[in-house]
Interface confidence: low
């Protein structure tokens, strides 16, 4: 019969014949022959392979480096990688969670829209006209400018997104 040019799912083509792939959690030791099956071996401790494969080496489990603020969220198995997460109060810098950063503060001119939680960083928003923030804070919202009128005063210096209005006494008209 003609040698195959393609193989079924969970098989691979080698030396003109279809061999079984190794199952997840196992690595390839030797290809099949006309007389023998594919030989596979389980991955060692701290190793994994998460697909049907013909890899000769298993992958090392991810190391959750405490010096980067990481800790193990889910321990790896022979079929799954370790999942890292950040220590309390820190946030992953990426979806892969390869390192962590402290949650950020909102700079002057920005206020906190949403306070940080264990899983989400601080969300900042620019202070709109009529509001200001003069501090770098992980808590403070933008504050409204002082209303000079309600204090029977006048605006001496306009407010910005970083500074409050400065109020002063009204000029009295002389008789």
């Amino acid at each position: 019969p003609e040698p195959p040019t393609a193989c079924r799912e969970k098989q691979y083509l080698i030396n003109s014949q279809c061999c079984s792939l190794c199952q997840p959690g196992q690595k390839l030791v030797s290809d099949c022959t006309e007389f023998t099956e594919t030989e596979c071996l389980p991955c060692g401790e701290s190793e994994f392979l998460d697909t049907w494969n013909r890899e000769t080496h298993c992958h090392q489990h991810k190391y959750c480096d405490p010096n980067l603020g990481l800790r193990v969220q889910q321990k790896g198995t022979s079929e799954t990688d370790t999942i890292c997460t950040c220590e309390e109060g820190w946030h992953c810098t990426s979806e892969a969670c390869e390192s962590c950063v402290l949650h950020r503060s909102c700079s002057p001119g920005f206020g906190v829209k949403q306070i940080a939680t264990g899983v989400s960083d601080t969300i900042c928003e620019p202070c709109p006209v009529g509001f200001f923030s003069n501090v770098s804070s992980a808590f403070e919202k933008c504050h409204p400018w002082t209303s000079c009128e309600t204090k029977d005063l006048v605006v001496q210096q306009a407010g910005t997104n970083k500074t409050d209005v400065v109020c002063g006494p009204q000029d009295r008209l002389r008789a």
Partner: nanobody, 117 residues
């Protein structure tokens, strides 16, 4: 298991006072900053106050500055919020929260404070 249990809420008249307590267990209380956060009916969460692990540094939202005092007793694993000169706008469910580096990872069930005449 981390547990935070608030108490001390209730109905109080405008201008009145209340003292909230938060009993903490399941973690090393004296190692963590602690926080009070509140949620008024139909509103989002609002940060109220925070205190560092030793109780020497405190932070307050502008809306409560000068009226509320946060404190802690590390020997009793308890966080407090003394609320004076209460106003109708202070009506909310008050939560204590455990934190590290000023974020919150565990919350209590909350205690309701109603300020009404």
């Amino acid at each position: 298991e981390v547990q935070l249990l608030e108490s001390g809420g209730g109905l109080v008249q405008p201008g009145g006072s209340l003292r909230l307590s938060c009993a903490a267990s399941g973690f090393t209380f004296l190692s963590y900053p602690m926080h009070w956060v509140r949620q008024a009916p139909g509103k989002g969460l609002e940060w109220v106050s925070s205190i560092d692990s030793r109780g020497s540094v405190t932070y307050y939202a502008d809306s409560v500055k000068g009226r509320f005092t946060i404190s802690r007793d590390n020997s009793k694993n308890t966080l407090y919020l003394q609320m004076n000169s209460l106003r109708a706008e202070d009506t909310a469910v008050y939560y204590c929260a455990k934190g590290h580096s000023w974020t919150f990872d565990y919350w209590g069930q909350g205690t309701l404070v109603t300020v009404s005449s």
